[in-house]
């Protein structure tokens, strides 16, 4: 057993051009906190896979407000270490994910809002009990500097925290065959309690008579390396010569225990011994409680009053994931108009508009008529990012500078003759028709169908169209 410790030294803009904007502002003050997730081995695992070695959340850092005009400095950090306790042997090789979270303290409805600023990941070899290891990781334009170490909790010692130490029974020296416990020279190695023959390098025990293997080793005494090559022999016992493990059928086949739990066979089935922080038949339930604040983005934590009862995060609309840490892709509904680019900022959707458009959803055409005149009394009409002129009667062209022939479109109906006039056009109607465009037939009794002729005008008189 032991503790992995992480010390964050700084989080701020990395070197080089393109310094990030400060995540906080006078309008939206914020503070940072960190989350670390540890997994055994060097395998590339998805960020969502379980933190089998454990996880920890830091305290919140001091509130920070950006100084107007100043570049983003190194941001104020939470006090103290992030500590991830591990119950079993330290694996020696591990993968880590360190996330930097921002807590916005503006006037959000329903309390503060959280958003992920940066996530770094890596794979490292580390012996327990060694000195602090320093590291620098970059995520986009941000840079995270940190140190880490693994230390054993007494009575465990050694690079994997698998050797046990006990206080000396005699002040001068350790008992026969027992060495002093470095670096605790005043303590001695405990008598060997593992199964006889259990490999001192690749095996360990926590109970008398057992022999549990470190990653990469197998066999009853942990002397057989697990082969990565395919096994050609039929199903049966493992071969110590080839190092090829061919498991026999059994309830612990494939290790049904999740999250780093160890499986042991029982007369009827199997039993999982779970690492700290997990429980359940297969160690599938996390022992984090609601008091640890596991639900992000305003998620409501239910249950989990103590480590022996599960918690569930009820996520607010727009968030998902077991800890409400993932945002639903609201931009997939394509709310931005006119080809605008959608950005989900968390607290709001933003649209980056194409040239010629503006507004929260790019719904407004910019006034392309600004500074553009339409001649001869024409009116400018905006649309589609370009302007056009609606010209007064008798004029045409892009800017209404061309004199138009009002008769070109043959506006007079029923064979009426068109005459251009300084203020428009005049139709001389054929017999039997009347109206500005000769559109109305005249009935035989002299009454017009629609409408009545204006006073002073007889059917057949030219009428000016205004």
């Amino acid at each position: 057993a032991g503790v992995f410790e992480l010390q964050i030294h700084s989080f701020g803009p990395g070197p080089g051009p393109g310094a990030p904007r400060s995540p906080c502002s006078a309008r939206l003050p914020c503070r940072l906190f960190f989350r670390v997730c540890l997994k055994p081995g060097l395998s590339e695992e998805a960020a969502e896979s379980p933190c089998a070695l454990g996880a920890a959340l830091s305290a919140r850092g001091p509130v920070y407000t950006e100084q107007p005009g100043a570049p983003a400095p190194d941001l104020p950090l939470p006090d103290g270490l992030l500590q991830v306790p591990f119950r079993d042997a330290w694996p020696g090789t591990f993968s880590f994910i360190i996330e930097t979270w921002r807590e916005e303290l503006g006037d959000q409805i329903g309390g503060p809002a959280w958003s992920l600023l940066a996530r770094v990941a890596g794979r490292r070899r580390l012996a327990a009990g060694g000195p602090w290891a320093r590291d620098i990781q970059r995520a986009g334009a941000w840079e995270l500097r940190f140190s880490y170490r693994a230390r054993c909790e007494p009575p465990a010692v050694g690079t994997a925290c698998t050797r046990l130490c006990r206080p000396r029974s005699a002040p001068s020296r350790c008992g026969p065959g027992l060495r002093p416990c470095a670096p605790l020279e005043d303590e001695c190695e405990a008598p060997l309690v593992c199964r006889a023959g259990c490999s001192p390098e690749h095996g360990f025990c926590e109970q008398p008579g057992e022999c549990r293997c470190l990653e990469g080793w197998t066999g009853p005494l942990c002397t057989v390396p697990v082969s990565t090559s395919s096994c050609l022999s039929p199903r049966g016992p493992s071969s110590a010569t080839t190092g090829c493990l061919v498991p026999g059928p059994g309830p612990c086949d494939g290790n049904p225990c999740a999250n780093g739990g160890s499986c042991s066979e029982t007369p009827r089935s199997f039993e999982c011994t779970c690492p700290r922080g997990f429980y359940g038949l297969r160690c599938e339930v996390s022992g984090v409680t609601c008091a640890d604040g596991p639900c992000f983005n305003g998620g409501l934590c239910v249950g989990g009053a103590d480590p022996d009862s599960a918690y569930i995060c009820h996520c607010p609309p727009g968030f998902q994931g077991s800890n409400c840490e993932k945002r639903v892709d609201r931009c997939s509904l394509q709310p931005c108009r006119n080809g605008g680019l959608c950005l989900d900022l968390g607290h709001a959707l933003r649209c980056r508009c194409r040239a010629g458009f503006a507004g929260p959803r790019c719904e407004h055409d910019l006034d392309d008529c600004a500074g553009r005149a339409c001649a001869n009394g024409g009116t400018c009409v905006e649309g589609g990012g370009a302007h056009r002129c609606s010209c007064a009667l008798g004029f045409g062209g892009r800017d209404c500078r061309e004199r138009a022939d009002p008769c070109a479109a043959r506006p007079c109906a029923h064979g009426g003759r068109c005459y251009a006039h300084f203020s428009g056009l005049v139709c001389a109607c054929a017999p039997g028709y009347m109206g500005a465009r000769c559109e109305f037939p005249v009935h035989p009794d002299g009454a017009s169908a629609l409408p009545a002729a204006p006073p002073g005008l007889r059917p057949g008189d030219p009428q000016r169209y205004l």
Epitope: G318, Q334, P335, R337, R361, C362
Partner: nanobody, 120 residues
């Protein structure tokens, strides 16, 4: 405040049909975009179908030809007609709307969800 109220969910056999409705009410000046998302058990929420800000109709690849989205502007309501339903369509279906409020601000709203179960 704006409310989105979904209805029409339920249990249906494979190959069957259902029609979901979502009515928006409250201080709505206009609805900019509106549609349906779904979240199958243990998976991410994904867009199923919607009317975009440009009033185009969009569909997830997996539902094209089987689902049809329609709307009644006068009632601020969208519908999702689901036919030839499959087991993998089982999910909670959420209505979503990008709304312009009387204040002229835009806000994105979610309904509470309606469960659709497809099983023999």
């Amino acid at each position: 405040e704006v409310q989105l109220v979904e209805s029409g969910g339920g249990e249906v056999q494979p190959g069957g049909s259902l029609r979901l409705s979502c009515a928006a009410s409250g201080s709505i000046l206009s609805i900019n975009a509106m549609g349906w998302y779904r979240q199958p058990p243990g998976k991410q929420r994904e867009l199923v179908a919607g009317f975009t800000g440009d009033t185009n109709t969009i569909y997830a690849e997996s539902v094209k030809g089987r689902f049809t989205i329609s709307r009644d502007n006068a009632k601020n309501t969208v519908y999702l007609q689901m036919s030839s339903l499959r087991a993998e369509d089982t999910a909670v279906y959420y209505c979503a709307a990008d709304v312009q409020l009387f204040s002229r601000d835009y806000e994105f709203y979610w309904g509470q969800g309606t469960l659709v179960t497809v099983k023999p």
